[in-house]
């Protein structure tokens, strides 16, 4: 969580970011909160990167005001207008690109004052692990697949009923470059799989973190995924 | 309730040009994108380029650069497409379309009814 | 640009068929693919955008998915009103563009 604040006292009003990541060629939220105002046509927001020349985005006396906008952000980028009046000057971005990433500034300009304040945004590509039995193995094993990650993730394999023990002896991983040629499809296979026992496939960067789980019992197979990005720190 | 209403068919003569208009109403104007597709008979659609009222900004389909100009009037909420060098294969409706998310460019969510442009000789 | 190529470009089917209807892109992966329905003298409608956000009021049986260059409509149990004309459209990038069009005609 970045929170800055103006430059004179009471001329300044509380800006909050929050640091994230982008799934690229996916929609991707820029987080920023500010002091509402009770005037819609009071409030400015300006969107600036680090080392592009124009804006990212500018909202002014209630609307989009995209002249300054720099060309690399046309048509790529919106506020919820509707909820600037209490507060939000959120950004939404359209096809999220590995050169969207950077430092970025929301800075905002109220009846109240004027407030910034920084936001790091990377890029990058997460997805969802799905864990299942490869019945075409000669002996029980286990396949886990995440269509899309960037940068090369780590793959680590856990048990409940071995915790601790190192899997890396007995799976085998491989990453397959998707027809884009940035993103890769992450496949990872556990061999020597017991049942009555839950496994976990853990897939990690720099931006996220998923975990496919897979309980296998006599009776019946469960699944479980999820995924946590790393970097949602405030400011 | 957003409504997208296009001048009538016309009828034009091959080397002549076509301003098709599509006035606007329920909605923010200069908010939205607003884009050209066009159709010939019996055939798929077409998309011809996209323009930003609030501030002029345009995109053009590479096959009708040069030759087709997207304009917009902020005081009347009127967009035009101007279609010059006419030939028998520019026959089709032309149809403009608001786009959704506002400055963001997202899908075509609304559409005119459609204006019949004919090339004959 | 990235071109459209969309699959079959017609298909016969009859009330509580299920339909699919997919299209592939050239290059890239973005999740910007719309579905749109269109009858004979009509303007488009939408019907999906962003592979697979059904529009307000669009009945549930239409659902579309994808990832990577391969998207699909899928029409769960189709209806007496569906039989129309299905055009895919990619609008993540600059240039927009469609597909050729599916024709769902009734057996």
């Known amino acids: 969580l970045i929170i800055g604040f103006g430059i004179s006292g009471r001329h300044s009003i509380t800006v909050t970011t929050v640091a994230s990541a982008g799934n690229i060629g996916e929609d991707g939220i820029l987080s920023c909160t500010f002091e509402p105002d009770i005037k819609l046509s009071d409030i400015v927001i300006q969107w600036l990167k680090e080392g592009v020349l124009g804006l990212v985005h500018e909202f002014k006396e209630g609307k989009d005001e995209l002249s300054e906008q720099d060309e690399m952000f046309r048509g790529r980028t919106a506020v919820f207008a509707d909820q600037v009046i209490v507060g939000n000057a959120s950004l939404r971005l359209k096809n999220v690109q590995l050169t969207d990433a950077g430092t970025y500034k929301c800075y905002i300009i109220t009846s109240k004052g004027k407030g910034n304040a920084n936001l790091e945004y990377k890029t990058g590509a997460f997805s969802m692990p799905e864990v299942n039995v490869d019945y075409n193995a000669s002996s029980e094993t286990l396949r886990c697949e995440a269509p899309r990650w960037f940068p090369q993730p780590t793959v680590v394999w856990a048990s409940q009923v071995d915790q601790g023990a190192n899997f890396s002896e007995v799976s085998n991983t491989s990453f397959e470059l998707n027809s884009e040629n940035v993103t890769m499809k992450v496949v990872s296979v556990l061999y020597n799989v017991t049942i009555n026992n839950t496994y976990s496939c853990m897939i990690e960067n720099d931006i996220a973190k998923a975990t496919g789980d897979i309980k296998v019992t006599e009776s019946e197979i469960k699944r479980r995924s999820h995924l946590q990005l790393l970097n949602s720190k405030a400011s | 309730e957003v409504q997208l209403v296009q001048s009538g068919a016309e009828v034009k003569k091959p080397g002549a040009s076509v301003k098709v208009s599509c006035k606007a109403s329920?909605?923010?104007?200069?908010?939205?994108?607003i884009g050209w597709v066009r159709q010939a008979p019996g055939q798929g659609l077409e998309w011809i380029g996209d323009?930003?009222?609030?501030?002029?900004?345009?995109n053009y389909n590479e096959k009708f650069k040069g030759r087709a100009t997207l304009t917009a009037d902020t005081s009347t909420s009127t967009a035009y497409l101007e279609l010059s060098s006419l030939r028998s294969e520019d026959t089709a409706v032309y149809y403009c379309?608001?786009?959704?998310?506002?400055?963001?460019?997202?899908?075509?969510?609304?559409w005119g009814q459609g204006t019949l442009v004919t090339v004959s000789s | 640009d990235i071109q459209m190529t969309q699959s079959p470009s017609s298909l016969s089917a009859s009330v509580g068929d299920r339909v699919t209807i997919t299209c592939k892109a050239s290059?890239?992966?973005?999740?910007?693919v719309a579905w749109y329905q269109q009858k004979p003298g009509k303007a488009p409608k939408l019907l999906i955008h962003?592979?697979?956000t059904l529009q307000p009021g669009v009945p549930s049986r239409f659902s579309g998915s994808g990832s990577g260059r391969d998207y699909t409509l899928t029409i769960s149990s189709l209806q007496p009103e569906d039989f129309a004309t299905y055009y895919c459209?990619?609008?993540?990038?600059?240039?927009?563009?469609f597909g050729q069009g599916t024709k769902v005609e009734i057996k």
């Open positions: 379309a608001r786009l959704d998310g506002s400055s963001y460019r997202g899908a075509m969510d609304s």
């Open positions: 329920g909605y923010t104007f200069t908010s939205y994108w």
């Open positions: 962003y592979t697979s």
């Open positions: 323009i930003y009222p609030g501030g002029g900004y345009t």
């Open positions: 290059q890239g992966f973005n999740k910007y």
């Open positions: 459209l990619q609008y993540g990038n600059l240039l927009y563009a």
